[in-house]
């Protein structure tokens, strides 16, 4: 089939990185700069993606593959192939329509992206709070009070914080 096809269509012989140039008797011409063809037999080359503005070039376009973008410092990629750049926030914050806002009490975010998530409820697993949560860190759950039979463990439950859930300043 390939042999028959190539006899009928000279363009099928053009490899990736070239295009079948109708202006030059259908010979295979290299893709111009800023364009590429990832498969053979193409009659045109595709225009390369340009990483502009908040995007920056992570990988230059080659004759056979498109450019790849990432985001400038202070932003991170969202979507397939980094189709969008979203502003970073600090740990302990989340991005809202009004900008970066601190996590509400009882929630945390340990990354520069994403939303604030509720602290783990230790009691649901029958455990106690070993280390209190902060805006930046989840609580650390310890053994359940029942596990702390006299002499069985040297772990001392933490003194309650002045503001529940937050470490003492």
């Amino acid at each position: 089939f390939e042999r028959t096809r190539s006899l009928q269509d000279p363009c099928s012989n053009c490899p990736a990185g070239t295009f079948c140039d109708n202006n030059r008797n259908q010979i295979c011409s290299p893709c111009p700069p800023n364009s590429f063809s990832s498969a053979g037999g193409q009659r045109t080359c595709d225009i390369c993606r340009q990483c502009k503005g908040v995007f920056r070039t992570r990988k230059e376009c080659s004759s056979t593959s498109n450019a790849e973008c990432d985001c400038t410092p202070g932003f991170h990629c969202l979507g397939a192939g980094c189709s969008m750049c979203e502003q970073d926030c600090k740990q302990g914050q989340e991005l809202t329509k009004k900008g970066c806002k601190d996590c509400c009490f009882g929630t945390f975010n340990d990354q520069k992206r994403g939303i604030c998530r509720p602290w783990t409820n230790c009691s649901l697993d029958g455990k106690s709070v070993l280390v209190n949560g902060t805006k930046e860190r989840d609580v650390v759950c310890g053994p359940s009070p029942a596990d702390l039979s006299p002499g069985a463990s040297s772990v001392t439950p933490p003194a309650p914080a002045r503001e529940p859930g937050h470490s003492p300043q």
Partner: antibody, heavy 117, light 107 residues
Framework: QVQLQQSGAELTRPGASVKLSCKAS????????IQWIKQRPGQGLEWIGT????????RYTQKFKGKATLTADKSSSTAYMQLSSLASEDSAVYYC??????????WGQGTTLTVSS | DILLTQSPAILSVSPGERVSFSCRAS??????IHWYQQRTNGSPRLLIK???ESISGIPSRFSGSGSGTDFTLTINSVESEDIADYYC?????????FGGGTKLEMK
């Protein structure tokens, strides 16, 4: 930080060949075109060619086809340019530079080639 | 092949003056032109990409304009450190090429 470290000055005889190197660091070597540029004393910049290290794809200006051969070693993140059948007019500073389509953002320090009998 | 012609070959200016460099392409190249500065005994450095896009770390007094065949690099207020050679490069078609350069000198 991105750096392109070029090999040291070369003094060679006419008719000989020489291989210049350009060692890249501070970025993913396979992700950007490497250009090679010639500059004779007191003259302008002359484009020789370019290589895409990921797949070895090369482009040359007509004048340097047969004179220059561009290669890239991914394992050492080094680009090479071999110049053959050297003559006095090949005496020049040769630069490698990273990036092509959006301009060359980073340049090596240049290698001085002197061809003399 | 696309030929790039830079003019004039030499520009003489006084500090604080506004100066413009011309780069003309032998056929239309869209905005695929980049500008470089090369000081004496130094490697070139990229000033402007795609005719008018600024480069991080380059002083704001450098700007570029143009599309098609005529392009201009402008220095808004020349400083002594700007004394150098200036080159344009096209990356619209193979083989890419540099212009012949313009030397900027102080009066």
């Amino acid at each position: 930080q991105v750096q392109l470290q070029q090999s040291g000055a070369e003094l060679t005889r006419p008719g000989a060949s020489v291989k210049l190197s350009c060692k890249a660091s501070g970025y993913t070597f396979t992700n950007y075109w490497i250009q090679w540029i010639k500059q004779r004393p007191g003259q302008g910049l002359e484009w020789i060619g370019t290589i895409y290290p990921e797949n070895g794809d090369t482009r040359y200006t007509q004048k340097f086809k047969g004179k220059a051969t561009l290669t890239a070693d991914k394992s050492s993140s080094t680009a090479y340019m071999q110049l053959s059948s050297l003559a006095s007019e090949d005496s020049a500073v040769y630069y490698c530079a990273r990036g092509l389509l959006e301009g060359a953002h980073y340049w090596g320090q240049g290698t001085t080639l002197t061809v003399s009998s | 092949d696309i030929l790039l012609t830079q003019s004039p070959a030499i520009l003489s200016v006084s500090p604080g003056e506004r100066v413009s460099f011309s780069c003309r392409a032998s056929q239309s190249i869209g905005a695929s032109i980049h500008w470089y500065q090369q000081r004496t005994n130094g490697s070139p450095r990229l000033l402007i990409k795609f005719s008018s896009e600024s480069i991080s770390g380059i002083p704001s007094r450098f700007s570029g304009s143009g599309s098609g065949t005529d392009f201009t690099l402008t220095i808004n207020s020349v400083e002594s450190e700007d004394i150098a050679d200036y080159y344009c490069q096209q990356t619209n078609s193979w083989p890419t090429a540099f212009g012949g350069g313009t030397k900027l000198e102080m009066k």
